[in-house]
Interface confidence: low
């Protein structure tokens, strides 16, 4: 019988008492085969973290800073359940640390040196740790003691709780630096008042502070937020302009064998019986013998943290950056304006080989990082382990939802000013064998389908989005008799036609022979009835243009396109017979890397782009014998995006809406994780 006990870690006598009450009340409402609570008492949160890592306890609720400690080796804990605040309809699990300034003050984030600063309090998250952590490497040396470095960076400050004797500049704007509400500039509202009164130039607070202190929109409009990319935004655009997004209070567990499903089952039942306004005798979010015992008193309930989410993704790049800087206190010897090497994310073995060749040829400008799936690559770019990769539109959508930005677009048509003119897109098509003359768009049910991969534009999002509108359910594996859609569940009928061996079967990378445009077409040639690809796929793999044994004798005339009106047309008539226009593949990166990725890639394509005539003896960035490694092989250049520099603008309203509709059918664990951080 599996042990269904969750050992909760308590850090004080009062917490232990509440834990025992929690245990006893859960026993009274949960059947004997359900989850139960046991209580383990430790002296501190760090002791609880160690106890969970050592399998002496299972769960504890932590503030963000401690979630970071819990994640670090050797603890390796992960977030499993989040407390939420506000309403069930609009649950808030995060707050945003922001830098507020007056509208007419005219400086940016990189011009804070010499300004006057208002802080909520020394050592507090939004008011000190995050802003000072992010500014850490810009502080004058020596950076220890930190208070002295901060005092020398700003021209004056109010940092309540600082030592006014040793660091008088930190108390210049609030004599005495009082550490309570007796100091008018203490806390969130106090730091904002410090700015409002004109004592300081910038206040480091949380996003809700300005709304709580200024009910009138006209008054709020006198203030702006400083963004990390050295721009400013209105105060209500905090989701796009903040220093960090911080989880409020989170239950953590072991990464391996951590009972996360059991913990969720327990807490979900607990909130049903003892959550807000549920029971008089025991309340989960109330602490008669103290404050915030086990859980925050202000919490309204729990949300399950998506399983794909590790602590780095949960805490976010900016927060982890800030805390690491403060904890480790190390900076590059001499930060230069020169760009660091761009770490390109390569999918599996084949892409890695090409990437390594690029790296050598780039003489240190490009480095390579490997991952097994596109989603793993996106996650690595998010957390800083990698910097960039080129993505199909479907993954540009996921990357965008995860906070990444498009920086350059692949162009597929030769033109005089290729790099200046991003194209409208390519065509997603449905290809069939000419010999299967009775097959149309309207009678695909029960046929064998070939897809580039789940989540990709031409191979999945467009055809399955159209299909969803027709059948109104997500059971595509029932609609087709079998198929190959790399990235599907291994036991799905949509993996049955795939050709990868062993663990590589149906994997969304080149280890699966039917992956990608060429792979999906090969699947049609060898096994399938219909392939969902791009309009260039058939000509690129017929007439001897692909020398591989399966393709060398193929003839374009033996294939036709399915049109949405139920007719069929020759392959070259794609402009009048396609499923939809698809956005070109695009390079994505983190916002902070945007300028460097743009600069280095433009240099690289001038060296190794389509201007290289002989690819047999030289490295060619856009060639890989029809395998579309790193970039599509038909890429002519990487083009500037001009103002289409967000994923919504780049993909276009129509495509974003189509993919949004298909999200009901999404199996993307990364998309689930990212929409948890930003619904």
């Amino acid at each position: 019988v599996p042990d269904k006990t969750v050992r909760w870690c308590a850090v004080s006598e009062h917490e232990a008492t509440k834990c025992q009450s929690f245990r006893d009340h859960m026993k009274s409402v949960i059947p004997s085969d359900g989850p139960s609570v046991a209580c383990v008492k430790k002296a501190s949160y760090l002791d609880c973290i160690r106890a969970i890592a050592a399998n002496e306890a299972d769960a504890v609720t932590l503030d963000a800073g401690l979630v970071y400690d819990a994640y670090l080796a050797p603890n390796n804990l992960k977030p499993v359940v989040a407390e939420f605040y506000g309403s069930k309809e609009d649950p808030q699990t995060f707050y945003y640390a922001v830098a507020v300034v007056k509208k007419d003050s005219g400086f940016q984030m990189n011009q804070l040196r010499g300004k006057k600063s208002c802080h909520t309090g020394l050592g507090r998250s939004a008011g000190w740790n995050i802003p000072i952590g992010l500014l850490y490497c810009d502080l004058p040396e020596p950076r220890k003691p930190l208070e002295k470095a901060v005092a020398n960076f700003f021209s004056g400050s109010c940092a309540p709780c600082a030592d006014g004797t040793d660091f008088p500049q930190l108390c210049q704007l609030c004599p005495g630096c009082g550490c309570s509400t007796l100091n008018q500039y203490f806390g969130y509202s106090g730091a904002f008042k410090c700015l409002k009164d004109g004592a300081g130039d910038v206040a480091f607070v949380k996003h809700s502070t300005i709304f709580e202190n200024l009910a009138n929109k006209a008054d709020r409009d006198q203030y702006e937020l400083l963004c990390l990319d050295n721009t400013r935004k209105p105060v209500d655009e905090y989701k796009d302009c903040h220093l960090a997004q911080v989880p409020s209070h989170t239950v953590v567990a072991r990464s391996m064998g951590g009972k996360e499903d059991l913990i969720w089952e327990l807490l979900n039942q607990a909130q049903e019986h003892f959550g807000k306004d549920k029971s008089k005798e025991f309340q989960l979010f109330s602490s008669p013998h103290g404050k915030d015992l086990l859980f925050k008193d202000s919490a309204h309930g729990f949300l399950k943290v998506p399983p794909r989410m590790d602590a780095k993704m949960y805490l976010g790049y900016e927060y982890v950056t800030a805390i690491r800087n403060l904890r480790e206190g190390t900076c590059p010897e001499a930060p230069t304006d020169e760009c660091k090497p761009v770490k390109w994310c390569a999918l599996s073995h084949h892409e890695r080989l090409k990437c390594d060749e690029w790296s050598v040829n780039s003489v240190g400008k490009i480095e390579c990082v490997s991952a097994e799936t596109t989603e793993d690559c996106i996650a690595k770019i998010m957390n800083g382990e990698a910097d960039a990769m080129s993505l199909d539109g479907g993954f540009v959508y996921i990357a965008g939802k995860c906070g990444l930005v498009p920086v350059l677009a692949e162009n597929y048509n030769k033109s005089d000013n290729c790099e200046d003119t991003p194209e409208a897109g390519y065509f997603a098509i449905a290809v069939v064998k000419k010999s299967a003359s009775d097959l149309t768009w309207d009678n695909l049910k029960g046929k064998k389908s070939c897809h580039t991969a789940v989540g990709r534009t031409a191979g999945w999002n467009i055809p399955m989005g159209l299909l969803y509108n027709k059948i109104n359910h997500c059971r595509f594996d029932e609609f087709f008799s079998e198929g190959c859609a790399p990235g599907s569940k291994k036991d799905s009928s949509l993996c049955k036609l795939c050709m990868g061996s062993g663990l590589n079967l149906c994997e969304p990378n080149n280890k699966e022979g039917y992956y990608g445009y060429t792979g999906a077409f090969r699947c049609l040639v060898e096994k399938g009835d219909v392939a969902f690809v791009k309009h260039q796929t058939v000509p690129q793999n017929t007439g001897g243009k692909n020398p591989d044994p399966w393709a060398k004798n193929l003839n374009e005339k033996d294939y036709e396109l399915l049109c949405l009106d139920g007719t069929r047309k020759p392959v070259e008539e794609y402009a009048n017979c396609h499923l939809a226009r698809a956005p070109n593949h695009a390079v994505v990166t983190r916002k902070d890397k945007e300028a460097c990725v743009h600069k280095i890639l433009r240099q690289q394509q001038h060296l190794f782009g389509s201007n290289v005539t002989d690819c047999s003896g030289n490295f060619c960035l856009f060639r890989s014998e029809t395998k579309d490694l790193l970039f599509r092989d038909d890429t002519v250049c990487l083009a500037k995006l001009h103002d289409r520099n967000t994923y919504e603008k780049y993909l276009g309203e129509e495509y974003v809406k189509a993919v949004g509709n298909l999200r009901k059918c999404s199996t993307s664990s990364l998309l689930e994780a990212c929409t948890f951080r930003r619904p």
Epitope: A73, L134, Y136, C137, L228, K312, Y317, E318, V320, T321, R324, N325, E328, T330, C331, P332, E333, P335, K340, K343, D356, S359, V360, G364, E367, C368, V369, S370, N383, G384, E385, D592, K593, C596
Partner: nanobody
Amino acid sequence: QVQLVESGGGVVQAGGSLRLSCVASGSVFSIDAMGWYRQAPGNQRELVAAMTNAGSTNYADSVKGRFTISRDNAENTVYLQMNSLKPEDTAVYYCNARSKLIARINNPYEYWGQGTQVTVSS
């Protein structure tokens, strides 16, 4: 944190050879690249050779063909084999490790050893 300890420095005649070693300890899982820098009196610290986890290498022009960098990932050690040494190679040689974990926005962390003196006499 990552700690780096160099060894193998010393005095050698021009044309001779030396092999420097650097052992990393601490959060070695975070290391993305290791390398060697040197600083001669009155000069800035300069790159000698570096090697990423993926095996990509980078050498200063002045040492190409004479110096070879290698890594033993299992032992968390980086080596610098220095052949055909010249008097102008005289400097303090520093081991460097760069962390791939999130650091300052846009800048990876760098860790440094204490340095080991290499003197090439003519």
